[in-house]
């Protein structure tokens, strides 16, 4: 599920339905944000590289009682091959940097958009 693939081909390859739905959920969160997301909760920043889905989940799973990101948490678990629980950290976390959930979601969305544009925009 985490393989984006296809970027060497002549045309772009659209995402799987699951990844498309994740992107759409991130868009919904960023566009419909009125009050501070998750009451301004802070999460560990991550390196947006290979394994980023698990790293993102490991970071976001530490936010509890925030219905706005529950769907995103569920979706990310579908992209992560191992079970993730609160307090778990991988080497992909930038452990000295915490950012607001809203910024984390925005960064993740921007990165996914960049990945899909890489194969088509010169």
């Amino acid at each position: 599920l985490t393989c984006l693939g296809g970027f060497a081909s002549p045309g772009p390859v659209p995402p799987s339905t699951a990844l498309r739905e994740l992107i759409e959920e991130l868009v919904n969160i960023t566009q419909n944000q009125k009050a501070p997301l998750c009451n301004g909760s802070m999460v560990w920043s991550i390196n947006l590289t290979a394994g980023m889905y698990c790293a993102a989940l490991e970071s976001l799973i530490n936010v509890s009682g925030c219905s706005a990101i529950e769907k995103t948490q569920r979706m990310l678990s579908g992209f992560c091959p191992h079970k993730v629980s609160a307090g778990q950290f991988s080497s992909l976390h930038v452990r000295d940097t915490k950012i607001e959930v809203a910024q984390f979601v925005k960064d993740l969305l921007l990165h996914l958009k960049k990945l899909f544009r890489e194969g088509q925009f010169n």
Epitope: G11, P12, P14, I23, F116, R117, F121
Partner: antibody, heavy 119, light 107 residues
């Protein structure tokens, strides 16, 4: 509300160039790609190309590669489409439209700019 | 390049009748197919995205179906304002392409 406002109609001579502008408002300009579509009189829709305003990266329909140039100015939230070496069959209405990512639909369109190429 | 073939080119119907428009892709495009309506002198307007997803503000009489290579736009009961040209669009791969259009005219 989201709006894409294009420059006015233009008349050009064969061999000349035209530059059409598309000013976006009501949303964050760099969050969406801007695509350009044209429609010759009485004909269907033809995709010309797209630009990612955030990076300036472009993608072109092979038919227009080398003759069309797409640019975007983040400071004014304006996209531009320049078409060079105009021919009579370039007479068309040119539309700008926004797309979140290329596989998304074109949810908002400019009003269109009629470019007439005539000697 | 993905070629989209729309049929029929023209559909002559009366208000209240059901309209069924077809769009066939030259290769599998999953559900990456969008439908637009265009009236004379106006820009196209998005009706349906991802083959069957409805747009807020678009009347419920418009519906889409299909996946892979065969797609259908259905207008359950034509209203006077529905007489227009309808285009399907490939969102699967570059170059983005449109069908030739189906004109729905008053019989």
């Amino acid at each position: 509300q989201v709006q894409l406002v294009q420059s006015g109609a233009d008349v050009k001579k064969p061999g000349a160039s035209v530059k059409v502008s598309c000013k976006a408002s009501g949303y964050t300009f760099i969050d969406y790609e801007i695509h350009w579509v044209r429609q010759a009189p009485g004909q269907g829709l033809e995709w010309m190309g797209a630009i990612d305003p955030e990076t300036g990266g472009t993608a072109y329909n092979q038919k227009f590669k080398g003759r069309a140039t797409l640019t975007a100015d983040k400071s004014t939230s304006t996209a531009y489409m320049e078409l060079r070496s105009l021919r009579s069959d370039d007479t068309a209405v040119y539309y700008c439209t926004r797309i979140l990512l290329y596989y998304y639909p074109m949810d908002y369109w400019g009003q269109g700019t009629l470019v007439t190429v005539s000697s | 390049e993905i070629v989209l073939t729309q049929s029929p080119a023209t559909l002559s119907l009366s208000p209240g009748e059901r309209a069924t428009l077809s769009c066939r892709a030259s290769q599998n495009i999953s559900d990456y197919l969008h439908w637009y309506q265009q009236k004379p002198g106006q820009a196209p307007r998005l009706l349906i995205y991802y083959a069957s997803q409805s747009i807020s503000g678009i009347p419920a009489r418009f519906s889409g179906s299909g996946s892979g290579t065969d797609f259908t736009l259905t207008i359950s009961s034509l209203e006077p304002e529905d007489f227009a040209v309808y285009y399907c669009q490939n969102g699967h791969s570059f170059p983005l392409t449109f069908g030739g259009g189906t004109k729905v005219e008053i019989k």
